[in-house]
Each structure stands twice: as C-alpha cells, then as structure tokens.
C-alpha cells in the first residue's frame, strides 16, 4: 500500500523592491506554484491556524514599518525608524484575514523607498484545520 | 478517492495576565479546541519532537523570566531584567516534559507583575513521531 | 478505517563543539533516528521547500560565522565578530543543497575555536513537496 502523501501546506514567499510612503510595499510572488495568493497588495489567508512569518529587507532610507492582518488589530510586526528588518514571528490568522504593509518615512519628500532583499514568507503550521477557498 | 487529511497538529496558545514573584505566570488557554493541555500551570508535552516556541509579553515592571521544560535542564528561554519579551525558539521536547515559567522581580516588594499581551505558543514540528496520551 | 499517519518530517539536529579557523564547524548528529543526513561536514537537503533553521552556540573567542547552502548564493546566516549566536531563520532550500559553516577568527593564532551548546536544527516546513533520495 502506498503511504499517504501530505497535501500541500499553505505557504508563500513574496518579494518587494519598493515601498510607498504613507502606504505599503508593492509585493509580488515570484513563483506560480505558491499555495497562497496575493490580491490587492495583500496576502490572502484561507486557512485558520498558526503561521510562521519571516520578514527581511534593506531599505534605502529610514522608515517605520508595520505588517497588519486585520482592521482594528495590532500589527504582526512593528519596526520604528529602521533601515533594515530581519524578523521572525508566529501568529494565529484566520480565513478572511489579509496580510499587508504600512510604511511611514521620516523625510519630508514623498519619494518611494527602494528595498533590497525584501522578502515576506508565511507558512501555515496547522494543516488539517479549517480552510475556505 | 478522497485525499488524506492531516490529523490535528499538537499546538497550543496560552495567555497570561499575571506573574507571581519567585513563582511563575498564571497561564490560561482561551480556546477549548487546543490539541495540547494545561495542568498545574504547565503545558503538558505528549509528543516527542521539535517544537516551535513563541513567547510574547509586556510587563508592568522589570523582571527576570525563564521558561523551563524539565527538572535539571537549562531553560528554553532566559531573559534578565526586561520589561517586555518577544522571542522565538526551537527545542526538542519529549513525552512527560512540562513547560512552565519561573519569574523573579528586582523590587523588594513581592507584588504580582501585571502582563499585557502575554502569550506563549507551542507548535509541534514532527507529526508522525512518538506520542503518548 | 485507520486514520492516515504523517510520514516522518525531514528534520535534523546537529551539534558542534569545535570550529576551525578559515574552515567550518565539525558537526555531528547525536541521534541515529534523524530523517536527514550529514555528509562531508554538511547537512544534505533532499526535499524542496521552506526550512526552519535554528542556530545556537557560545564560542571560546570572537569569530565571524556564516552558514551557507549553495555556491554563489548569500549565506543563510552571517554574524560578524560575535562570541555567541542564538538565531532563527526561514529559508527556501532545494534538492542538492548542502548546509555548511564558514568561520573566521580575528586572532593571529590559528587555534580551533571551542564551542559550548553548539546546535544547528533544520526542520522542513513543506512536506508533500518534491523530494529525491
């Protein structure tokens, strides 16, 4: 008998090379094989459960950056006046959540912020739980 | 043929709003659906394997905090003279281990320490390994 | 009907007690039950996907340490002039990758660096993906 295979785990890696002041970072998914989707510059959460979240990037100027998942809730990450980020977190997310950036720069100009190595990874940790597509 | 489903992953999120000096933090599990249990203020480990561990909290005063899993073993986390914690770790835990806090404040009084956002998450990383219930 | 079991997750914990200047750290796997293998002082990657990586250690002298996975690619971790490390990361690795150390000390002597609590853990996060053995 063939041993059971794992159904694919919900996970995604998005890249970002540019962030807009007072807005967010422009995210793109380099792979077509991702099991999660990007929509309106947000990562769509379909499955309830814990997620492992990795955020990396080097910014062209000092900024404050937050990663949100739901209106009215505190951010997943919040970094104040940084030029780089390399953080890992765990959070419980649920169907209908959307993961997105908010960025503020401290310069008077409203130029875009350039990003090197900008990468956001989400990996679902509770396969077998509730999902809605 | 229906694709195999994942059996539930062993995971738990406990909250704590209060820590007692020279003792630990009073942990409660907000969800009844957790696949791991709290007993005598400890999280009970039933399954051998690696665990992803996330610890967060904002404390009303400076304290030193350790997270233990087995008598005679070093702590999973150890933080000295902090007013907040936001740490992630990986550790190998085994059946019969119990994850619990130890806290010391540096004030002369023996006050309870209040906690906002106190959260401890454990997620098993090796489903398919040995478990005993 | 018996519910499907999880096939073993690809994971490994290696220990290292000694690092050689201008070379790497001598890694050994304390358990025979690991689902990943060590070969030529490297951890062999057989399965594509995200990996949770934990690196810990206390060094007998100041050193610079990098953890690589593929020729011509940047390191998974890079620490400059440290006497200890306690880091967690997430990275996408693929079949044929090999995870290995590179170490440089800043002393004129070329003595080995002694390590306490030297531990490197890799845990595959995408079971169900491509593997080749």
């Amino acid at each position: 008998q063939v041993p059971p295979q794992y159904p694919p785990i919900q996970s995604i890696r998005v890249q970002f090379t540019r962030c807009e002041n007072e807005k967010g970072c422009i995210i793109t998914s380099p792979s077509k094989d991702e099991t999660m989707k990007v929509q309106d510059n947000s990562i769509i959460i379909n499955c309830d459960g814990f997620y492992l979240i990795s955020l990396k990037g080097y910014f062209s100027e000092e900024l404050s950056l937050s990663l949100y998942y739901r209106k009215g809730r505190g951010p997943l990450f919040s970094l104040s006046k940084v030029t780089s980020v390399d953080s890992i977190g765990v959070a419980y997310l649920a169907f209908k959540d959307k993961v997105y950036f908010n960025v503020t720069t401290h310069s008077t100009s409203y130029k875009d912020i350039q990003v090197n190595g900008g990468e956001l990874i989400l990996i679902h940790q509770n396969p077998g739980g509730f999902c809605a597509y | 043929q229906v694709p195999p489903q994942y059996p539930p992953i062993q995971s738990i999120r406990v909250q704590f709003t209060r820590c007692e000096n020279e003792k630990g933090c009073i942990i409660t599990s907000p969800s009844k659906d957790e696949t791991m249990k709290v007993q005598d203020n400890s999280i009970i480990i039933n399954c051998d394997g690696f665990y992803l561990i996330s610890l967060k909290g904002y404390f009303s005063e400076e304290l030193s905090l350790s997270l233990y899993y087995r008598k005679g073993r070093g702590p999973l986390f150890s933080l000295s003279k902090v007013t907040s914690v936001d740490s992630i770790g990986v550790a190998y835990l085994a059946f019969k281990d119990k994850v619990y806090f130890n806290v010391t404040t540096h004030s002369t009084s023996y006050k309870d320490i209040q906690v906002n956002g106190g959260e401890l998450i454990l997620i098993h990383q090796n489903p398919g390994g040995f478990c005993a219930y | 009907q018996v519910p499907p079991q999880y096939p073993p997750i690809q994971s490994i914990r290696v220990q290292f007690t000694r690092c050689e200047n201008e070379k790497g750290c001598i890694i050994t796997s304390p358990s025979k039950d690991e689902t990943m293998k060590v070969q030529d002082n490297s951890i062999i990657i057989n399965c594509d996907g995200f990996y949770l990586i934990s690196l810990k250690g206390y060094f007998s002298e100041e050193l610079s340490l990098s953890l690589y996975y593929r020729k011509g690619r940047g390191p998974l971790f890079s620490l400059s002039k440290v006497t200890s490390v306690d880091s967690i990361g997430v990275a996408y690795l693929a079949f044929k990758d090999k995870v290995y150390f590179n170490v440089t000390t800043h002393s004129t002597s070329y003595k080995d660096i002694q390590v306490n609590g030297g531990e490197l853990i890799l845990i595959h996060q995408n079971p169900g993906g491509f593997c080749a053995y």
Partner: antibody
C-alpha cells in the same frame, strides 16, 4: 519638557465616529506604553485603552471593546483613539497618558480633549 | 472585573493628617498608584508603586498598601491639597480606577 497634547474632540451624533489624536514630545515615544483615560462630566476617571510601545499589544475596557481602537504612529510620535458607534455615555474629556515602567503608573498626562455625543 | 472602593468625600482640618483609603480584594498583592486632580485640571501622579513619590511631589504625601486596603496619607494637609484623589491598579490586562475621594481642607 514632557508634553502630551490631545486634539480631535467634537460634538458627534449617536452612532457616529471620531478619531482623537495625542501628539507627544519630550521623551522617546517609541519606548513607552500608552493609555487613554476618560472622565464623564462630574464623574471619576475611567481607563479606556492600552497600547504597548510597539503597538503590537492592545487592551480595552469592556464597554468600548469592538467600538474603539487604540493605535500609534511612532514615526509621528502620535497616539490615536478611533471611536466608532458612539453612544451618549461616551461623552467625556479624553486624556492620553504615558505609562511608566514602575507598575504602569501614568506618570504624564495631557490636558484632555472633549467629546460630546448628543442627538 | 476588579473593583476599587473609595469614600466619595473626606474633610480634614488645615495642617492635620489626612488618610484616604482604597479598598480592593487582596489589593496588597497589587501595585497601587495615586493621582491628584484639581478642579479643571488633568490628573497628576503623586504616588506610584504603593509608596514611591515622583520627583517634585512634596514629602507630606506618602502611601501604604497591605491586605485589602491601600492608604494615601497627607501628613499635614494644606489648602492647596484640596482636590480629588484616585487610586489605580492593573488587573488582568486592564487598568482600574477607584471612584475617587474629594478632599476638603477646612
């Protein structure tokens, strides 16, 4: 000199919305937890909401949960209180307060901004 | 939720000691803070962590806390001490204020 200056108070109809702001100076805003406290006319102090220094942890008094949202912009050294579905009993002077690391006492307060909810 | 009980008002003769109490279940296990609020002004922290005085607060103000009662003492009340006094604690991620005591200096 530590200063906290609230603004945004107004006359609002029931079920309406309003956002209060508190601009701070004189201390490292991004290092301190903050709170909003209110005082209804002729009444005592009532704690409303808490936010951690990095904005990742929040808590609320029961009567405003689900209606009010506390947030902060550390870049702008500003604390906010978004108030939705306002009720007549939300009428009060709203103070922002800095929390110390000694038992979360509120060691500095603003002068307050007034909210009137009336039809 | 946790409840703090204060007497609504208290009179004290000029230059005499005043004791303002704050009752709560096992309040001695919690850190109590005291605030003074004069008419039309914002509150001011006068005692934190049961008995510590912030810089600039006169020595006549002191605090104690044990059992089910915390006490704010003004060793010799002055006319300028006429105000509302509030105790405050944290409990289960929430802050709680007492109802306040109005001190009148006669």
């Amino acid at each position: 000199e530590v200063q906290l200056v609230e603004s945004g108070g107004d006359l609002v109809k029931p079920e309406g919305s309003l956002r209060l702001s508190c601009v701070v100076s004189g201390f490292t805003f991004s290092s301190y937890d903050m709170s909003w406290v209110r005082q209804a006319p002729g009444k005592g102090l009532q704690w409303v909401a808490y936010i951690s220094f990095d904005g990742r942890s929040t808590s609320y008094t029961d009567v405003v949960k689900g209606r009010f949202t506390i947030s902060r912009d550390n870049a702008k050294t500003t604390l906010y209180l978004q108030m939705n579905t306002l009720r007549i009993e939300d009428t009060a002077v709203y103070y922002c307060a800095k929390l110390s690391s000694s038992g979360w006492s509120m060691d500095y307060w603003g002068h307050g901004t007034s909210l009137f909810v009336s039809s | 939720s946790y409840v703090l009980t204060q007497l609504p008002s208290k009179n004290v003769t000029l230059k005499q000691p005043a004791h303002i109490t704050c009752g709560g279940d096992n309040i001695g296990s919690k850190s109590v803070h005291w605030y003074q609020q004069k008419l039309g002004q914002a509150p001011v922290l006068i005692i934190y962590y049961d008995s510590s005085r912030p810089t600039g607060i006169p020595e006549r103000f002191s605090g104690a806390n044990s059992g089910n009662t915390a006490t704010l003492t003004i060793s010799g009340a002055l006319a300028e001490d006429e105000a509302d006094y509030y105790c405050q604690v944290w409990d289960s991620s929430a802050s709680v204020f007492g109802g306040g005591t109005h001190l009148t200096v006669l």
